[in-house]
Interface confidence: medium
């Protein structure tokens, strides 16, 4: 299965509410493995 | 306010080991994902490792040219991460930077230390 | 390893003119690529992330775009402290890799 920061990150999230690829949470902090570095 | 502060750079001979350390405030470090980047004199940025959250088991990755001999850790006790290098090269000489990023709320952030030195010489 | 190309590698322009710089990756990465500027004895500074999202605080001159393989970072109109080196970088895969770097220099 995908390991990359991208694929964790979207499992992480769990619901995505993607913009350019970002994912969004407005409660806790969600690690964005790729999108930001 | 978000600070990164390395330590423990500095010159030692090949074949030498060194630790650095990152120190972190101003938000909760268990939290997040954070990188060691490294700049060659002169050259361009590296990405050298990269360990996951405290909830991610904090999880390693390195780059190719480091494996083996470099290793990544966090005490989050201390709010602090780390980087072992063992074996060092001539090629390890760089500053190398803590990088830290993640998602808080609708705004992605990206902070970076403002480096430590590490020279590898006879 | 995905390898990025920045060109040109230095690109001599005036205050005012319109500066257009290239990272192409030699695999697919989607949109997972930032844009860094870097000044000597600074740290790197984020631009763009997502391939065309521009980070906080950064001024709308700046400008990313594409997608897949090939990507773009634009300043419309060049201000003299804009001049400095840029660095693409993608985080579609490990190991996450930056370009060599675009040395944009006054004319």
């Known amino acids: 299965s995908c390991n990359t920061a991208t694929c964790v990150t979207h499992r992480l999230a769990g619901l995505l509410s993607r913009s350019g690829g970002v994912v969004k949470d407005n409660f806790v902090p969600t690690n964005v493995g790729s999108e930001a570095f | 306010e978000v600070q990164l502060v390395e330590s423990g750079g500095g010159l030692v001979q090949p074949g030498g080991s060194l630790r650095l350390s990152c120190a972190a405030s101003?938000?909760?470090?268990?939290?997040?994902?954070i990188s060691w980047v490294r700049q060659a004199p002169g050259k361009g940025l590296e990405w050298v490792a990269e360990i996951r959250s405290e909830s991610d088991a904090s999880a390693t990755h390195y780059a190719e040219a480091v494996k083996g001999r470099f290793t990544i850790s966090r005490d989050n006790a201390k709010n602090s991460l780390y980087l072992q290098m063992n074996s060092l090269r001539a090629e390890d000489t760089a500053v190398y930077y803590c990088?830290?990023?993640?998602?808080?709320?609708?705004?992605?952030?990206?902070?970076w230390g403002q480096g430590t030195l590490v020279t590898v010489s006879s | 390893e995905i390898v990025l190309t920045q060109s040109p590698a230095t690109l001599s322009l005036s205050p005012g003119e319109r500066a257009t710089l290239s990272c192409k990756a030699s695999?697919?990465?989607?949109?997972?690529v930032s844009w860094y500027q870097q000044k000597p004895g600074q740290a790197p500074r984020l631009l763009i992330y997502?391939?065309?999202n521009r980070y906080l605080g950064i001024p709308a001159r700046f400008s990313g775009s594409g997608s897949g393989t090939d990507f773009t970072l634009t300043i419309s109109s060049l201000e003299p402290e804009d001049f400095a080196v840029y660095y693409c970088?993608?985080?579609?895969?490990?190991?996450?890799?930056f370009g060599q770097g675009t040395k944009l220099e006054i004319k």
């Open positions: 695999k697919r990465v989607t949109t997972y």
């Open positions: 990088l830290l990023y993640f998602d808080y709320g609708l705004a992605i952030q990206n902070y």
């Open positions: 101003g938000f909760t470090f268990s939290n997040y994902w």
């Open positions: 970088s993608q985080s579609y895969n490990y190991p996450y890799t």
């Open positions: 997502g391939a065309s």
